[in-house]
């Protein structure tokens, strides 16, 4: 650091004073010199280092009428908000000719009430779940001892005797407030008060109770909620998308979920208006007066297939001699699953019913036995999925074929000699 030489008398007639105060204090250091001729620029040192960006001003006035007379120079260094980094030894420095002069030192010290570097933050925690809170304070003067308070009640007999920087809370069953006091020789500072809100624990064991094509019954086990009873639980269901890849803990799915509320108890809910034979993901959260729990992970579920809700449409049956031509269209009503085929039944007035599995074709030619004199022959068709048969169509009487009527070429299906199985219907 530059040092004043003793060859000439120091020009400084006033040296920086001392400042000791609390953080945030605004203070001013000044030095004064008297020089002959053009006044020099006054620099400020802190702990021997020139302050390049000092908030300083310099005021100078000539004592005489001649510029070569003496000048009074006052340099002022302003400290706007005292911080720990401002503390140290301060001096003024001037270069006069080939010499360097340094004033006597002044000292800036920080001393006051403790200052918080970290304070407890508001947060939410699940009931009976451990968590930590942080508090950190410093002087000077040191040492700084902390005292934690819960709901304004000290958690130790004296400052410094209990937990210090980190408070471990094994769990809460009610919403509580926490603060910490910082004590030093100058007094006490109290931190902000953090509110720790106790929410219900995440529900567990979300599972399916029963499945139907358009509804799922689900149940779960509620988590602890402290002294606050659960008011309701909310269940969300979303259509699964193969490309979406919902996994445990992943972000919310892109579709708008179907949301249902359940009064509790019981911790069970019937989700209706679902699509049959469709994969869904479901999750549940439960709410008390303090707020909602976290959601469970998404659980993949699937509605089962159902039977078709309606019979095949536009059934026509025409007869030409010993052959009968029957065709139909797919049911307009929801299939509730994957269509596996059609069943056809026909019966004469005095003959047993014949039941056939046609597969996925929508037309068939029946080869009637005998001379074709079976009277009042009627045909019924039903669609089926893996879940079973849908409703049968109303019996359609066989009409005689009239010349000129279009007749598609059908694969002949020989009527079996004995019925494949008999079906009690209509």
């Amino acid at each position: 650091a530059p040092r004043g030489t003793q060859a000439e008398e120091s020009p400084f007639v006033g040296n920086p004073g001392n400042i000791t105060g609390a953080r945030g204090l605004t203070g001013t250091l000044r030095c004064q010199l008297q020089v002959q001729g053009e006044p020099p620029e006054v620099h400020w040192l802190r702990d021997g280092q020139i302050l390049e960006l000092a908030d300083s001003t310099q005021t100078q006035v000539p004592l005489g009428e001649d510029e070569q007379d003496d000048w009074i120079v006052v340099s002022q260094l302003r400290i706007t908000s005292l911080q720990l980094s401002d503390t140290g030894q301060y001096q003024c420095l001037v270069f006069l000719g080939h010499q360097t002069f340094v004033s006597q030192p002044g000292y800036v010290g920080l001393e006051g009430l403790p200052y918080f570097l970290e304070e407890p933050e508001d947060r939410t925690v699940a009931a009976n779940t451990p968590f930590n809170l942080s508090c950190q304070a410093q002087g000077p003067p040191e040492p700084v001892d902390l005292l934690w308070l819960q709901d304004a009640v000290p958690l130790a007999t004296a400052p410094g005797h209990g937990p210090q920087r980190s408070l471990h809370v094994p769990g809460l069953n009610k919403t509580s407030s926490f603060s910490c006091e910082a004590h030093n020789a100058k007094g006490v500072t109290t931190s902000r008060t953090a509110t720790i809100t106790v929410l219900p624990q995440q529900p567990r064991n979300l599972h399916l109770v029963s499945r139907q094509p358009t509804e799922l019954e689900v149940a779960w086990t509620p988590g602890l909620s402290g002294i606050y009873p659960l008011t309701h639980c909310t269940l969300q269901a979303v259509l699964s998308d193969d490309g979406m890849g919902i996994q445990a803990g992943e972000p919310d799915p892109p579709e708008e979920p179907l949301t249902s509320q359940a009064s509790v108890p019981p911790h069970q809910l019937r989700l209706g208006s679902l699509h049959p034979h469709t994969p869904y993901h479901i999750r549940v959260a439960c709410t008390s007066s303090q707020g909602p729990s976290s959601w469970t992970h998404w659980l993949p579920v699937e509605t089962p297939e159902g039977v078709p809700l309606g019979p095949p449409e536009n059934i026509s049956a025409t007869r030409n001699g010993s052959q009968a031509f029957v065709h139909w269209q797919e049911p307009r009503a929801p299939l509730q699953g994957t269509l596996l085929g059609y069943r056809l039944a026909y019966q004469g007035q005095d003959t047993p019913e014949v039941l056939m599995d046609i597969g996925l074709r929508q037309e068939v030619t029946l080869e009637l036995q005998g001379d074709g004199s079976v009277s009042n022959l009627t045909v019924c068709v039903a669609a089926y999925t893996a879940a079973g048969d849908g409703p049968w169509s109303l019996p359609v009487p066989l009409e005689a074929w009239r010349p000129g009527q279009a007749q598609p070429v059908h694969q002949l299906v020989k009527e079996p000699s004995t019925p494949a199985f008999s079906w009690p219907w209509w």
């Epitope: 007639v13 006033g14 000044r30 004064q32 001003t57 005021t59 009074i72 002022q76």
Partner: nanobody, 115 residues
Framework: QVKLEESGGGLVQAGGSLRLSCTAS????????MGWYRQAPGKQRELVAA???????NYRDSVKGRFTISRDNAKNTVYLQMDSLKPEDTARYHC?????????WGQGTQVTVSS
């Protein structure tokens, strides 16, 4: 804009005393240097006395030991106590305030010392 107003001047016999006051319209604690200047007819203006924020006073050689400058920051006032006045002290006395590159001047008060 800071206004400086001088008072206390007058006619006094040689060897007598006067106390000049300079009151500022704003706080004077921020002014690094406060001074009293004088200007006699047909002469250059000259610094009589100055006082800094460190309460260090400077005087013109011709007034040393006779004049005393002081400042009262609480009253925003600077004083010049003039004792053992001489006829050559006759002049218009002006108050001045300096801070960095700013300076303010008063209109002055007349001091006449008769022999």
């Amino acid at each position: 804009q800071v206004k400086l107003e001088e008072s206390g001047g007058g006619l006094v016999q040689a060897g007598g005393s006067l106390r000049l006051s300079c009151t500022a319209s704003a706080s004077i604690s921020s002014f690094d240097i406060m001074g009293w200047y004088r200007q006699a007819p047909g002469k250059q203006r000259e610094l009589v006395a100055a006082i800094t924020t460190l309460d260090i006073a400077n005087y013109r050689d011709s007034v040393k030991g006779r004049f005393t400058i002081s400042r009262d920051n609480a009253k925003n006032t600077v004083y010049l106590q003039m004792d053992s006045l001489k006829p050559e002290d006759t002049a218009r006395y002006h108050c001045a305030a300096f801070q960095s590159d700013q300076n303010y001047w008063g209109q002055g008060t007349q001091v006449t010392v008769s022999s």
